[in-house]
Interface confidence: medium
């Protein structure tokens, strides 16, 4: 493929090079299965370049396809742990708007202490992303065990 | 979003197409938990285009954020075999320059023979990675089981 | 790194936006380890945009390094069954043309109901990638459990 | 249902000879890589030998090289390991297991419930 003949040319701006990379802040109160993230350069190597945190849910600030990416370790956990405490599930999703609501990525634990997984999705300006942890154990803050992402991909 | 108005253009070369992915090379001696990885066209399917390899370790050639991932598979494994020899954990981080030293991530195997993952992580110019297996079981060499990559995804 | 002064500019045709998310179809007959797969907009939330399907089977369109992910779950699974159903293992492969076949991704759930990974790979126009599913267990049609996606990342 | 089935341990004088069977079925034997792994007492697994589909090609741990010989059957699905000159430090739990790829080291998704080899006087 050559690279230089094409007329239109690609402004840097409209690459859409947003991107973020969150670490986890708390779980929720008791009926709230949702963890609420943080991200920014004073807390270690997350940061939000385009999306933004809307009380610890992060929301979409261009349409586009993104490629979503998420690790949750289970603290204080070891494999029998994890199978005693059965189903423990993470599901990442549309949450806001109601009218785009859609569960993007589940996983379950089964006898692992940890999940990680990835996937291209269409999202749109103003998706928020929920990512809820059903189950009765309690996810590690240690920011190389438990983080969530999203990169722009394409328009 | 419109591509062809704004007049900042977008010279290929800054698009920092830096990547990298490589396969085993081998373990290191007694104390070394590190990894040591090779890559290149004559090794199969890995390659390196701009990061470099220093001793087997991942050197960053280009500012930015990366996606960095992994995949290990334990060789003569069965789910018996890695729980009897847990832990087994797998990190990956920045071992030098010393002053930038970080875990940025890390798995246990439990009960699995094979961990995978992914995440976005600020690198800088001369950043070294090290993947450090802990235990005493030994990871696959076979291509399609262990590989360790970066792909550069913005300034 | 500046961006607007190099003389080679990039058009936005040549980026090769190549990208596809699938979700699963249906299995193979009796002896075909092979899973099939379907994408577009009509069907939730995959998509193609470059690569094309042939009989189920995802084929190159661009040459080029590309990110390959995927996950797939098991349905009707729990760690006891996936263990006694053992070896169940899934593979990402480059199955046509004969000449370029290949393993590029291996996993086995052990006592696992989910795998997911994803790698970096070189790519060719023509190239068909196969995913084949041994064992006896059969995977989840859900669209947030099973996926499989292609991501263009550079030339 | 996949298995494996190893027969032939025992016990055995230093310097005698072994040759341990596995049985395979449930899976296309000649398809597949398969190997020989030991356990010794108190000790980790130690990779043995191996050997490809077709039986062309061989690979052995610098501990057993010129002693061991493994050979397969395709016809009857047997994997074998012919154990010479054996030595105190070879009793171990000898499993056969089916491999996913050709290397030394790879990985093995199938394996037998191993049969005891004791070598002493």
């Known amino acids: 493929q050559r690279f230089a003949q094409a007329q239109q040319q690609l402004p840097l701006e409209s690459l859409g090079w947003d991107v973020a990379e969150l670490q986890l802040n708390h779980t929720g109160p008791q009926q709230d299965p949702r963890l609420y993230w943080q991200g920014g350069p004073a807390l270690g190597r997350s940061f939000l370049h385009g999306p933004e945190l809307d009380k610890g849910q992060l929301r979409i600030h261009r349409d586009g396809i993104y490629m979503v990416h998420i690790q949750v370790t289970l603290a204080i956990c070891s494999s029998t742990t994890a199978s005693r405490h059965h189903p423990t599930t993470l599901a990442v999703g549309i949450c806001s708007p109601a009218s785009r609501s859609i569960s993007l990525l589940r996983l379950s634990f089964h006898q692992g202490c940890t999940i990680a997984s990835q996937r291209l999705t269409p999202l749109a300006r103003g998706d928020t992303l929920c990512t809820n942890l059903t189950g009765t154990l309690l996810p590690s803050r240690n920011t190389d065990e438990t983080f969530f992402g999203v990169q722009w991909v394409r328009p | 979003q419109r591509f062809a108005q704004a007049q900042q253009q977008l010279p290929l070369e800054s698009l920092g197409w830096d990547v990298a992915e490589l396969q085993l090379n081998h373990t290191g001696p007694q104390q070394d938990p590190r990894l040591y990885w090779q890559g290149g066209p004559a090794l199969g399917r890995s390659f390196l285009h701009g990061p470099e390899l220093d001793k087997g370790q991942l050197r960053i050639h280009r500012d930015g954020i990366y996606m960095v991932h992994i995949q290990v598979t334990l060789a003569i494994c069965s789910s018996t075999t890695a729980s009897r020899h847990h832990p087994t954990t797998l990190a990956v981080g920045i071992c030098s320059p010393a002053s930038r030293s970080i875990s940025l991530l890390r798995l246990s195997f439990h009960q699995g023979c094979t961990i995978a993952s992914q995440r976005l992580t600020p690198l800088a110019r001369g950043d070294t990675l090290c993947t450090n297996l802990t235990g005493t079981l030994l990871p696959s060499r076979n291509t399609d089981e262990t590989f360790f990559g970066v792909q550069w995804v913005r300034p | 790194q500046r961006f607007a002064q190099a003389q080679q500019q990039l058009p936005l045709e040549s980026l090769g936006w190549d990208v596809a998310e699938l979700q699963l179809n249906h299995t193979g007959p009796q002896q075909d380890p092979r899973l099939y797969w379907q994408g577009g907009p009509a069907l939730g939330r995959s998509f193609l945009h470059g690569p094309e399907l042939d009989k189920g089977q995802l084929r190159i369109h661009r040459d080029g390094i590309y990110m390959v992910h995927i996950q797939v779950t098991l349905a009707i699974c729990s760690s006891t069954t996936a263990s006694r159903h053992h070896p169940t293992t899934l593979a990402v492969g480059i199955c046509s043309p004969a000449s370029r076949s290949i393993s590029l991704l291996r996993l086995s759930f052990h006592q696992g109901c989910t795998i997911a990974s994803q790698r970096l790979t070189p790519l060719a126009r023509g190239d068909t990638l196969c995913t084949n599913l041994t064992g006896t267990l059969l995977p989840s049609r859900n669209t947030d459990e099973t996926f499989f996606g292609v991501q263009w990342v550079r030339p | 249902e996949v298995q494996l089935l190893e027969s032939g341990g025992g016990l055995v004088q230093p310097g005698g000879s072994l040759r341990l069977s596995c049985a395979a079925s449930?899976?296309?034997?000649?398809?597949?890589?398969m190997g020989w792994v030991r356990q010794a007492p108190g000790k980790g697994l130690e990779w043995v030998s191996s050997?490809?589909?077709?039986?062309?090609?061989?690979y052995y741990a610098d501990s057993v090289k010129g002693r061991f010989t493994i050979s397969r059957d395709n016809s009857k699905n047997t994997l074998y390991l012919q154990m010479n000159s054996l030595r105190a430090e070879d009793t171990a739990v000898y499993y056969c297991?089916?491999?996913?790829?050709?290397?030394?080291?790879?990985?093995?998704?199938?394996w037998g419930q191993g049969t005891l080899v004791t070598v002493s006087s």
């Open positions: 297991a089916r491999k996913h790829g050709e290397y030394y080291d790879s990985g093995y998704d199938v």
């Open positions: 050997i490809n589909g077709s039986g062309r090609n061989t």
């Open positions: 449930g899976f296309t034997f000649s398809s597949e890589a």
